[in-house]
């Protein structure tokens, strides 16, 4: 086992919430069996750890939310990988296992006396980010009636409550964006469309939903293809030639694709001289990512994409951008991250990394090239959901009592799940957070359009929205050319 | 939690092997969350439990195999369901968890003394039967370096050692039968073929392999369709009409299907008057099952199917058929099974079931309507594989020593895995058991043909074999008509 994964961020409290964030990148193929993770991550990792710590501080200082009860946490690193996340989840449930070992008399003291435990059980888990990892974690957590609230796992499979009863999410299922894509196709009377999807759960289930819904609307999916994100040039060329063979009839290409699949298509368009021949309609794997279009803007022009609605959270930046390694000691990964971010050595610090020659100077600040994690609002909403669920449960089980009454010791996961499913509150961006019977949240998307804004200057602009079934589009903006 | 699942079959020994068998049917949809299993099973359940117990007796009394070491077991019920199997697997690994709790000082005695454990750790696990369940179990076991040997989980996904390092099987991957099906298509120069597969892992991955291999061989898969086994009449009719529309060119239909999907197709053929128009080539989901063709024999005539080679094991029947509830007390499910099998009440027994009115009489015998589990040979080979792996490990770690030397206390799962992967021995049916680099066993299949043997008498007959890449077919037998 790799020692870095043993690191845990703890914050004490009357009730402990677990969290799984991808503090490090996933293990490379040769390191998978050791479960040795990759480099530290800022957006998907450190920022989320800090969001958890700071959000709990905010909740604990809010007199209207869980009065007389402090929330603590145990944050673990999933490394965006099933095996690592599962191993860490076992740490979460260790306590439940040991308590039942004692019940069954499998742990005994040498002198026959009873043993005691030194760790509070986890009542719920926030995360992890990836759907396939979340599925594995849920398989384990549900055995112990531990609710799980995800902030970015959007796979349709997770809506199946017979399989994933204790799973909820503050993001919609991908079925919603499939619907949004169909609604766009309908709006512009595109009756003959080619389709591409990325191999794997995200692309396959998303495209299946898109095709089913299209069929019901009388839209002909002329031809459908799939490709791996990491496929070679030849595979992408072959695919483009197939799409080309259906021109000019099937000019629209619906792509339920990861970002790197879209990039592969754009690169093949360049090689085959096909810029401008297709109109790409992309799912949120593309969204408004510059790493998808960088260097291939001309091929991407006109693309219409779906993006999950999540404005930046200002108060998080106010907190985060002030953090420094000499004072932020509660985040056990922070020094490692600081050195990685600024490629320098924190001399004299516990986690000093000698691989960096340059010493970190005191003028460094996180404001430099700062980009807030695009899912920040969802992460915070997931934490607040857990707090509101516990609050409602306390109100119902301990009427007229401030704090944890006996009826909440220990916390019953089944009751907490019921309470969470009924939760609704105003989220961090002012939108209503609530859960349907499948534990899913409403679909709210922005519709983006990739345009040439001026000579050799390209950008994504917001041309519409899709909110829980209602599509609004600025048609003039979609079809206008900027660079006249 | 349902109490029946807490039942465990134990057999003491120096080394304990875990096993997961589907002693009960899977929970019905309304019982899934309680993980309350269905009725007791004979072939897939009780027979496999008895096979484990009796095979270990045979191994323990064999002076040449693990001399001075007794093998014991802990058999648990998977109920053919992921959540149940995962819960049971946690019981297997509890011990590892507790030992590390102690290392980390999380379990302490009131007086500060050390705790001790009263249960031997499991060194490996046999089973479970289903691929999707085996995947879940493997995800957990590999975290603790516990090798798993499966006897009927054939999904191609399980060959991926980056994902499933500690997984091995005495059955081939479905990629092999896909290859066998392609070889049959090639042999008869069928260049234009329609394809059908059952929705789900088995059908999808199998058909994908079949299509990839066909393409390489220049075989045109004209049209490819998928359907759920439990789809309605209309869905099957619709599919048959699509297949019909490609007649007479695409008369061969390759079906990588579960048995009930094939049955659905046969029933639709009856409704649409299409008996005899197609030649079905079926995977081992059909094999030689009468429950697939029953009542629809005329539609199935000519079908060529793949069946895993596994002759009955005579010595198992010699043992099993003598078992009686008053003497077979080591199998904790046996009384429940006996009452279910004979629909009677075992009066005065511990597990007497009052739902049966009739009392079981002493003349009852398992010989009545006995059918040996079709996978029996594989179950036994899996157990022997574990024994030979441990034997070879002992020979290498404890040279010149009979019994467990210190180098094997505790048993290191990584070393055991290495030893298992190198294992080869003569299996229960006289064939060589060995594992390739993916932990898979060679593909050995029988080719069956469903024929009209006389007026209104139909049966499967063996018309060939496919052994590790070599197809042998009795062409005259395939194309002859019996009922002249």
């Amino acid at each position: 086992q790799s020692s870095e994964r043993r690191v845990v961020a703890h914050m004490p409290g009357d009730i402990i919430i677990g969290a799984l964030f991808s503090v490090h990148h996933q293990p490379t193929v040769d390191k998978v069996h050791e479960r040795k993770c990759g480099a530290v991550r800022e957006q998907y990792g450190i920022q989320r750890v800090e969001a958890m710590l700071h959000t709990l501080e905010r909740i604990n200082s809010d007199p209207t939310l869980l009065p007389n009860i402090t929330l603590g946490c145990e944050i673990r690193d999933s490394c965006w990988h099933s095996a690592v996340a599962l191993e860490q989840s076992i740490e979460f449930i260790r306590d439940s296992l040991i308590s039942s070992e004692e019940e069954e008399g499998l742990v005994r003291c040498v002198d026959g006396s009873s043993s005691f435990r030194s760790k509070k059980p986890i009542v719920g888990v926030i995360g992890p980010g990836s759907s396939s990892v979340a599925i594995q974690v849920q398989n384990l957590l549900q055995l112990f009636n531990i609710p799980q609230i995800a902030y970015s796992a959007t796979s349709m499979d997770l809506s199946d409550k017979t399989l994933f009863k204790y799973f909820m999410r503050v993001v919609p299922s991908d079925a919603q964006q499939a619907r949004a894509m169909v609604d766009i196709v309908k709006r512009y009377n595109w009756t003959y469309v080619s389709a591409v999807h990325t191999e794997g759960n995200y692309g396959e289930s998303g495209m299946e939903a898109f095709k089913d819904m299209s069929a019901k609307e009388g839209i002909c999916i002329a031809h459908s293809y799939k490709i791996y994100s990491n496929a070679g040039e030849q595979s992408f060329d072959k695919l483009l030639k197939k799409l080309r063979s259906h021109l000019p009839k099937a000019r629209v290409v619906a792509c339920f694709c990861e970002g790197m699949t879209v990039r592969g298509l754009l690169m093949a368009m360049r090689r085959l001289g096909l810029a401008g021949e297709f109109l790409l309609l992309g799912s949120d794997g593309w969204a408004d990512r510059y790493d998808v279009t960088d260097g291939y803007q001309r091929e991407a022009v006109g693309g219409i994409t779906i993006k999950l609605q999540s404005p930046d959270v200002k108060w998080f930046d106010d907190y985060y951008l002030k953090l420094r390694p000499e004072t932020n000691l509660r985040n056990p990964w922070f020094q490692e991250f600081w050195q990685h971010r600024f490629q320098c050595r924190l001399e004299g610090f516990a986690q000093e990394n000698s691989k960096y020659n340059k010493t970190c100077n005191s003028s460094l600040t996180l404001r430099t090239h700062h980009v807030q994690d695009s899912k920040m609002g969802f992460v915070i909403n997931a934490i607040y959901s857990m707090a509101y669920g516990l609050h409602n449960m306390q109100m119902s089980l301990c009427p007229g009592y401030a704090g944890l009454c006996d009826a909440m010791k220990p916390i019953d996961g089944r009751k907490l799940l019921d309470s969470l499913m009924k939760t609704n509150f105003t989220g961090v961006s002012g939108d209503m957070i609530l859960f349907d019977e499948n534990g899913d949240s409403p679909g709210r998307y922005e519709i983006m359009n990739f345009k040439e804004m001026g000579k050799d200057y390209f950008d994504y602009i917001n041309v519409g929205s899709w909110d829980n079934g209602e599509l609004k589009m600025d048609d003039d903006e979609v079809w206008s050319k900027k660079n006249n | 939690q349902s109490s029946e699942r807490r039942v465990v079959a134990h057999m003491p020994g120096d080394i304990i092997i875990g096993a997961l068998f589907s002693v009960h049917h899977q929970p019905t949809v309304d019982k899934v969350h309680e993980r309350k299993c269905g009725a007791v099973r004979e072939q897939y359940g009780i027979q496999r439990v008895e096979a484990m117990l009796h095979t270990l007796e045979r191994i323990n009394s064999d002076p040449t195999l693990l001399p001075n070491i007794t093998l014991g077991c802990e058999i648990r019920d998977s109920c053919w369901h992921s959540a149940v199997a995962l819960e049971q697997s946690i019981e297997f690994i509890r011990d590892s968890l507790i030992s590390s709790e102690e290392e980390e000082g999380l379990v302490r005695c009131v007086d500060g003394s050390s705790s001790f454990r009263s249960k031997k750790p499991i060194v490996g696990v046999i089973g479970p039967g289903s691929s999707s369940v085996a995947i879940q179990v493997q995800n957990l076991l590999q975290l603790f370096n516990i090798p798993q040997i499966a006897y009927s989980a054939t999904s191609m996904d399980l060959s991926d050692k980056t994902l499933f390092k500690y997984f091995m099987r005495v059955v081939p991957s479905d990629a092999q039968q896909a290859r066998a099906m392609v070889d049959i298509v090639k042999r008869y120069n069928w260049t234009y073929v329609s394809a059908v597969h059952t929705e789900g892992n088995y059908g999808e991955s199998g058909m994908e392999a079949f299509k990839d291999m066909s393409a390489k061989e220049g075989i045109c898969i004209a049209h490819s369709y998928k359907i759920y086994s439990n789809a309605g009449e209309q869905s099957f009719d619709k599919l048959l009409k699509k297949l019909r529309s490609h007649l007479p060119k695409a008369r061969v239909v390759a079906c990588f299907c579960e048995g009930m999907t094939v049955r659905g197709l046969l029933m639709a053929m009856r409704r649409l008057g299409l008996a005899g128009e197609f030649l079905l080539l079926g995977s081992d989901g059909w094999a030689d099952r009468y429950d697939v063709t029953d009542g629809y024999q005329r539609e199935a005539v000519g079908g060529i199917t793949i069946k895993l080679q596994s002759p009955d094991v005579k010595w198992f029947d010699d043992y099993y058929l003598k078992l009686r509830p008053e003497t077979n007390l080591r199998n904790p499910w046996f009384q429940e099974f006996w009452q279910h099998r004979f629909q009677c009440r075992l009066e005065g027994f511990a597990q007497e079931n009052s739902k049966y009115n009739k009392t079981c009489n002493s003349s009852l015998t398992l010989r009545t309507h006995h059918v040996q589990d079709s996978k029996m040979g594989f179950v036994i080979n899996a157990i022997y594989s574990m024994a030979y792996g441990l034997h070879n490990m002992q020979m290498s770690l404890c040279p010149g020593y009979a019994g467990l030397c210190d180098a094997m206390k505790p048993i290191d799962g990584r070393k055991l895995l290495d030893s298992l992967m190198k294992t080869n021995f003569t299996g229960v049916s006289g064939d060589m058991i060995l594992f390739d680099e993916n932990g898979d066993s060679p593909g050995r299949y029988e080719i069956m043909n469903f024929k009209e043997m006389g007026k209104d008498y139909f049966d499967y007959i063996n018309v060939g074999s496919w052994d590790n890449g070599e197809l042998k077919m009795d062409d005259d037998e395939v194309w002859s008509k019996k009922n002249n």
């Epitope: - | 009719d237 529309s245 007479p248 409704r271 649409l272 008057g273 299409l274 008996a275 005899g276 128009e277």
Partner: antibody, heavy 121, light 106 residues
Framework: QEQLVESGGGLVQPEGSLTLTCTAS?????????MCWVRQAPGKGLEWIAC???????TWYANWAKGRFTISKTSSTTVTLQMTSLTAADTAAYRC??????????????WGQGTLVTVSS | ALVMTQTPSSVSAAVGGTVTINCQAS??????LAWYQQKPGQRPKLLIY???DLASGVSSRVKGSGSGTEFTLTISDLECADAATYYC????????FGGGTEVVVK
């Protein structure tokens, strides 16, 4: 041009037998469409009798026709209907028809003009 | 066995009018139903298949509808040439014709 022509009809004694022939021209049996027989008693409705697959030679019959009527393919362009134990109730115009799609249970796309069978003493 | 019941046995309507013929199946046949027109001394002519699809060369005045066990043939803007007997045929788990409906155009 696709055409079906029936022959072999006429007067037959009760309990007698008769074989009708349907000859196809301009039709390729290898296209797989099924050939069937349908009858129509004078002033009455249509009644399906039987169908045959040109590929497998499998046959399908109406329940009432089983045992007395036999459909068979005698060449790549002819189909016959053998009728035994005839009674007055079998008096009808017998038409040959080709299915619209492959399969015994289908609409009939092409019809012959019919041949009259009269069962009388 | 599949049985088809057709109603009415006879119907008359004026030129330019509309007639509706019903057909009931003894079991669920989904959309596996055809309609034919037959004039005296002529062979039957396929009008509709799969309950609502128009056979080639058939006037769009002819419309089929229904599924399961209840089906309808509607002929609008009646012409003299529409005078004939109309038959339904169920083709699912067997072939069976309805008894026929004579349409008289006045």
């Amino acid at each position: 041009q696709e055409q079906l022509v029936e022959s072999g009809g006429g007067l037959v004694q009760p309990e007698g037998s008769l074989t009708l022939t349907c000859t196809a021209s301009g039709i390729d049996f290898s296209s797989g469409y099924f050939m069937c027989w349908v009858r129509q008693a004078p002033g009455k409705g249509l009644e399906w009798i039987a169908c045959i697959s040109p590929y497998s030679d499998n046959t399908w019959y109406a329940n009432w026709a089983k045992g007395r009527f036999t459909i068979s393919k005698t060449s790549s362009t002819t189909v016959t209907l053998q009728m035994t134990s005839l009674t007055a109730a079998d008096t009808a115009a017998y038409r040959c028809a080709r299915t619209m799609a492959i399969g015994a249970y289908n609409p009939f796309k092409l019809w012959g003009q019919g041949t009259l069978v009269t069962v009388s003493s | 066995a599949l049985v088809m019941t057709q109603t009415p046995s006879s119907v008359s309507a004026a030129v330019g009018g509309t007639v509706t013929i019903n057909c009931q199946a003894s079991q669920n046949i989904y959309s596996n139903l055809a309609w034919y027109q037959q004039k005296p001394g002529q062979r039957p002519k396929l009008l509709i298949y799969d309950a609502s699809d128009l056979a080639s060369g058939v006037s769009s005045r002819v419309k089929g509808s229904g599924s399961g066990t209840e089906f309808t043939l509607t002929i609008s803007d009646l012409e003299c040439a529409d005078a004939a007997t109309y038959y339904c045929q169920g083709y699912y788990s067997g072939n069976a014709f309805g008894g026929g409906t004579e349409v008289v155009v006045k």
